[in-house]
């Protein structure tokens, strides 16, 4: 006879799966906060900074009541993919001033990538419909100046921090509904 069958596959507890995703998101939120503070210390921001290529905010107090797990995970994954792309672009094209944020910016990129893989895994474990592969995004234009790179960094880290902050709250809320 062939090898004995392996142990029965235990279906994962969705709350536990979501818990570990919340932990990762919280951890990345803390990393982003520290890096944004570091950026502000080195290059104080004068007013607000926007970048048209960044995703628009997906969550607010009013949206919390109608949250559904598939929608939240799909949107969060799409937004974080965009931020990952922007962080990669920042490291490549941000100019010499932003090299002072290494290796922290590289660590942030790696952790963002890890959270994205965790979200992908969570979606497959919960048997949620997988989003279609992302269409190739148009390349981001290099900053027009060193100051342009710094302004972009403020916008990217600020936007990522806000997205992660709402993500933690949304995921915590969804956990209670499972």
């Amino acid at each position: 006879p062939g090898p004995p069958p392996g142990p029965p596959r235990v279906s994962p507890d969705p709350r536990a799966e979501l818990d570990s995703t919340v932990l990762l998101t919280r951890s990345l939120l803390a990393d982003t906060r520290q890096l944004a503070a570091q950026l502000r210390d080195k290059f104080p921001a004068d007013g607000d900074h926007n970048l048209d290529s960044l995703p628009t905010l997906a969550m607010s107090a009013g949206a919390l009541g109608a949250l559904q797990l598939p929608g939240v995970l799909t949107r969060l994954r799409a937004d974080l993919l965009s931020y990952l792309r922007h962080v990669q672009w920042l490291r490549r094209a941000g100019g010499s001033s932003l090299k002072t944020l290494e290796p922290e910016l590289g660590t942030l990129q790696a952790r963002l990538d890890r959270l994205l893989r965790r979200l992908q895994l969570l979606m497959s474990r919960l048997a949620l419909p997988q989003p279609p592969p992302d269409p190739p995004a148009p390349p981001l234009a290099p900053p027009s100046s060193a100051w342009g790179g710094i302004r972009a960094a403020h916008a990217i880290l600020g936007g990522l921090h806000l997205t992660l902050d709402w993500a933690v709250r949304g995921l915590l809320l969804l956990k209670t509904r499972l």
């Epitope: 919280r26 607000d48 905010l57 902050d165 933690v168």
Partner: antibody
Framework: EVQLLESGGGLVQPGGSLRLSCAAS????????MNWLRQAPGKGLEWVGV????????FYADFVKGRFTISRDNSKNTLYLQMNSLRAEDTAVYYC??????????WGQGTLVTVSS | QSVLTQPPSASGTPGQRVTISCSGS????????VNWYQQLPGTAPKLLIY???LLPSGVPDRFSGSKSGTSASLAISGLRSEDEADYYC???????????FGGGTKLTVL
């Protein structure tokens, strides 16, 4: 630097109205939900209500429902609190505060509202 | 009567560690993030801890937060005279559909 500056407080008679403003600067106002909170003299903090970043949703504490209205003008980076049918127990320092998720990460310095005849 | 329950006062001597408790229910602390605010005399409140145990930038790591079930606590180690203030816990409440606070704890540094 994030700054929130309340104005419009003062002395008003019971049953009267008052409109508070909160001028925001140093951040992208239109990205953040905004709140009003209050603190009666010598008492604790009390949440009044929240308005979503795009003004599409508002939530209020039970004690102000139907009397207070929160609004915002994103083009002017300003938050408002319209207070009607004021009572003596509404006497408090009123604060505006920014919400990035579940918490209030920046607060204004507050404006005092006194309801008395 | 506040929805979240805190001791009205706490005290300690410089260098000591003090803990402030905050208890609630499943509709607030049990299901939602707990935040802590510090209010120095005559000033506006300031965020001290968010999402149960995260520190905003600029807050010294002498401050820490924790949560278990429907209770949370704030710990301050290496107490300093400038820590003398009112401390408030807060959370969203699913039943009330709003933010609730504890009554505040007045911390005295002896």
């Amino acid at each position: 630097e994030v700054q929130l500056l309340e104005s419009g407080g003062g002395l008003v008679q019971p049953g009267g109205s008052l409109r508070l403003s909160c001028a925001a600067s140093g951040f992208t106002f239109s990205h953040y939900d905004m709140n009003w909170l209050r603190q009666a003299p010598g008492k604790g903090l009390e949440w009044v209500g929240v308005i979503s970043y795009d003004a599409s949703n508002k939530f209020y504490a039970d004690f102000v429902k139907g009397r207070f209205t929160i609004s915002r003008d994103n083009s002017k980076n300003t938050l408002y609190l319209q207070m009607n049918s004021l009572r003596a127990e509404d006497t408090a320092v009123y604060y505006c505060a920014r919400t990035p998720g579940s918490h209030f990460d920046y607060w204004g310095q507050g404006t005092l509202v006194t309801v008395s005849s | 009567q506040s929805v979240l329950t805190q001791p009205p006062s706490a005290s300690g001597t410089p260098g000591q560690r003090v803990t402030i408790s905050c208890s609630g229910s499943s509709s607030n602390i049990g299901n939602n993030a707990v935040n802590w605010y510090q209010q120095l005399p005559g000033t506006a409140p300031k965020l001290l801890i968010y999402y149960d145990d995260l520190l905003p930038s600029g807050v010294p790591d002498r401050f820490s937060g924790s949560k278990s079930g429907t209770s949370a606590s704030l710990a301050i180690s290496g107490l300093r005279s400038e820590d003398e203030a009112d401390y408030y816990c807060s959370a969203w409440d699913d039943s009330l559909n709003g933010v609730v606070f504890g009554g505040g704890t007045k911390l005295t540094v002896l």
